[in-house]
């Protein structure tokens, strides 16, 4: 494998020419201007000081310019996501310049060596940008660096080294190992561009976190909590085939950031929204579905520029595949009394009925415990747009679904053999839609019957006062 890299990030490669033997110095970072959506097209290789390729490939000095930066690789060949991203950018921004930063010779190394090469690659990009800035009409403000994994930190270095400030850097699951907790000048950080937005899809609090856990941008978005991505479980990626390994799960979750970004480009009519929250647990409890004071934003390409004084962590749920958009609902259930609850938490399900569609039966995830004489908040989400909600069916699951719960029930029975039956009283459910920011209160169909017990269900209909709108802004999409 190529080892001798000079300070300029070049690799020596002896080429034997027909007439004379000579050593040609080949750049270890290449900039390929993708002029066409056609993958067969060779594009144009740009190099500092050479204006001809810019003319040959009709580089548009006044248009947006995207630099796509891949990450560490175990292969000498581009990974498939690159084609999808280039194609999506061409589809969405027809006049834009799309440049692939090919640093495979420096990335196809031991991970530690590739990490050490990120600075060199960042310098190369900065030099290219400095040279382009010398051209009339070229503006750094129109530059958008998109870096995946290790490439996100390369983008950070480029933004740090360039003369001036690039318009935007998008970090797609920035690499974690050797960057977690690092100094801001040694990783992607908010001061690397006018706007730095980040998608975190493979963060782990235990074991090795492939993606960085800490927030590193102006906005840091953690889809599905930033860890377990739907459709990436062993069962999903392996199907019935036994050939796969855990590597496929890692790739699926890590690469999900790229596909979420691609989705935002090609499915702009189905934007996904993320909501500001202090942590994943609070988001799972349904507490953070507000759009007040810039607390929500579109994810990916459509993200609105937010330059907060301090970093903003945002969360959302997604589908398992494109289009990734789901519809989030906050459900506030006031439990005003309960009887004989015992040790175990009830398992609740809701079904939402709307003007457009009805949801599947959705579990209410109890993050901590059901509180009595208190409002319990839950997050539920649907894959389809239900329209205006009409009614809700709340079901308390009967027979326990887990051995753990069965054991707890058995213990409960031993201590209270004549348990007269567990019961909860719920009068109303307040629902807030994350996507529309509309709030609605649902009351029990029969005001006299507010109790629910295991194996039973309770129906709620829209209360007479109907939709209540608070002065909360809806997360409208502002297309860049």
């Amino acid at each position: 494998s190529p080892v001798p890299f000079g300070p300029e990030g070049r690799l020596e490669d002896k080429l034997h020419k027909p007439k004379a033997t000579q050593t040609e110095v080949k750049p270890s970072v290449r900039f390929n201007l993708r002029t066409s959506k056609d993958p067969e097209h060779e594009g144009c290789y740009l190099s500092v000081g050479h204006s001809q390729p810019l003319e040959d490939c009709s580089f548009n000095m006044t248009a947006k310019t995207f630099f796509i930066i891949h990450g560490w690789t175990m292969s000498g060949i581009f990974e498939n996501w690159l084609h999808k991203l280039v194609s999506a950018l061409h589809t969405r921004e027809k006049d834009a310049n799309v440049v692939v930063v090919d640093w495979l010779p420096l990335a196809h190394q031991l991970y530690t060596d590739a990490v050490n090469n990120t600075r060199v690659v960042g310098h190369s990009i900065a030099r290219m940008l400095d040279w382009l800035q010398e051209k009339d009409d070229f503006s750094l403000g129109n530059v958008h660096l998109i870096g995946y994994s290790l490439g996100a930190h390369v983008a950070g270095y480029a933004g740090n080294f360039v003369k001036g400030t690039v318009g935007r850097i998008t970090g797609l699951d920035p690499a974690g190992p050797m960057f977690e907790g690092a100094d801001i000048h040694k990783r992607l950080s908010p001061d690397d561009a006018d706007f730095v937005d980040v998608l975190h899809t493979y963060t782990r609090s235990f074991g090795l976190s492939i993606g960085i856990q800490m927030p590193v941008g102006h906005i840091d978005i953690y889809p599905n909590g930033g860890d377990f991505q739907p459709g990436c479980g062993l069962n999903d990626v392996l199907g019935s085939i036994a050939y796969g390994t855990i590597t496929e799960v890692v790739k699926c979750e890590h690469e999900r950031a790229v596909h979420l970004f691609v989705d935002s480009l090609v499915n702009q009519d189905k934007p996904s929204f993320a909501f500001q929250c202090t942590d994943s647990n609070r988001f799972k409890k349904g507490i953070c579905l507000s759009c007040r004071k810039n607390r929500c934003n579109s994810i990916g390409y459509n993200a609105k520029k937010m330059r907060n004084k301090r970093n903003s962590k945002m969360y959302l749920k997604t589908r398992a595949g494109m289009p990734f958009r789901v519809y989030h609902y906050q459900m506030k259930i006031h439990v005003f009394s309960y009887k004989n609850m015992g040790e175990i938490e009830p398992t609740f399900y809701v079904t939402l009925y709307g003007t457009n569609a009805d949801s599947q039966t959705l579990p209410l995830e109890i993050v901590e415990r059901i509180e009595q004489n208190a409002t319990n908040t839950f997050l539920v989400y649907t894959e389809e747009d239900l329209g205006d909600l009409l009614k809700i069916q709340l079901t308390w699951e009967g027979a326990s679904q887990s051995w753990y719960n069965l054991w707890k029930e058995f213990r409960s029975y031993l201590s209270q053999p004549r348990n007269p039956g567990r019961e909860l009283n719920i009068r109303r459910i307040r629902v807030k839609s994350g996507e529309t920011q509309r709030k609605l209160t649902f009351c029990t169909e029969d005001p006299e019957n507010t109790s629910i017990s295991p194996g039973r269900e309770l129906w709620f209909r829209k209360c007479r006062d109907g939709w209540r709108m608070k002065n909360e802004t809806s997360p409208t999409v502002e297309l860049p």
Epitope: P39, S75, I77, F78, N80, G231, D236, E248, K251
Partner: antibody
Framework: QVQLVQSGAEVKKPGASVKVSCKAS????????MHWVRQAPGQRLEWMGG????????TYNEKFKDRVTITRDTSASTAYMELSSLRSEDTAVYYC????????????WGQGTTVTVSS | EIVMTQSPATLSVSPGERATLSCRAS??????LHWYQQKPGQAPRLLIK???QSISGIPARFSGSGSGTEFTLTISSLQSEDFAVYYC?????????FGQGTKLEIK
């Protein structure tokens, strides 16, 4: 026009090695990946691996990883595929194929090299 | 490893008629699907790339569609030279894999 010309047919004994060459012309050899695909009689096509001729980085099918080596000589615009520890099941037609910029589809193929493994 | 399954194994169609060939992937491959034609004693020839992109020099009667796990190659009006074996190939993840082929024969 783009052309990929492969070396001639080979007959090998089990346990031996074979090295097939593929000379490219009509395009910049270092700008596109080169892949090797084989086809045993009556069987589906099987991707063996590929090389990035620009710097020599390779990717192999795990099935062949311990036995296949793909190399290139940029001065001769030629890619090579060497398969070792040959067995009768390796009897097949071996093709080189030029990848697109991303290495995903193969618009140009060599004429194929028949390798027969027989004792 | 992504397994590609083509159907039917053999398709008998009369010249001038329409032929529809199917290819299924064992998991989502987005649009990373390519179609090839192979005649006896010849190397495969690329017909369609990335599910639906046409190839210069390939007659317009060849078209591709699909995304995710289900893909289709359609030959709108069969010519005598179209009778051959057709393969699909995925490039979504390594190892790249091919289908077992569909033999298109004259009815």
């Amino acid at each position: 026009q783009v052309q990929l010309v492969q070396s001639g047919a080979e007959v090998k004994k089990p346990g031996a090695s074979v090295k097939v060459s593929c000379k490219a012309s009509g395009y910049t050899f270092t700008d596109y990946t080169m892949h090797w695909v084989r086809q045993a009689p009556g069987q589906r096509l099987e991707w063996m691996g590929g090389i990035n001729p620009y710097y020599g980085g390779t990717t192999y099918n795990e099935k062949f990883k311990d036995r296949v080596t793909i190399t290139r000589d940029t001065s001769a615009s030629t890619a090579y595929m060497e398969l070792s520890s040959l067995r009768s099941e390796d009897t097949a037609v071996y093709y080189c194929a030029k990848g697109d910029y991303y290495g995903g589809s193969y618009n140009y193929w060599g004429q194929g090299t028949t390798v027969t493994v027989s004792s | 490893e992504i397994v590609m399954t083509q159907s039917p194994a053999t398709l008998s169609v009369s010249p001038g008629e329409r032929a529809t060939l199917s290819c299924r992937a064992s998991q989502d491959i987005s649009n990373s699907l390519h179609w090839y034609q192979q005649k006896p004693g010849q190397a495969p020839r690329l017909l369609i790339k990335y599910a639906s992109q046409s190839i210069s020099g390939i007659p317009a009667r060849f078209s591709g569609s699909g995304s995710g796990t289900e893909f289709t190659l359609t030959i709108s009006s069969l010519q005598s030279e179209d009778f051959a074996v057709y393969y699909c190939q995925q490039s979504n993840s390594w190892p790249y894999t091919f289908g077992q082929g569909t033999k298109l024969e004259i009815k």
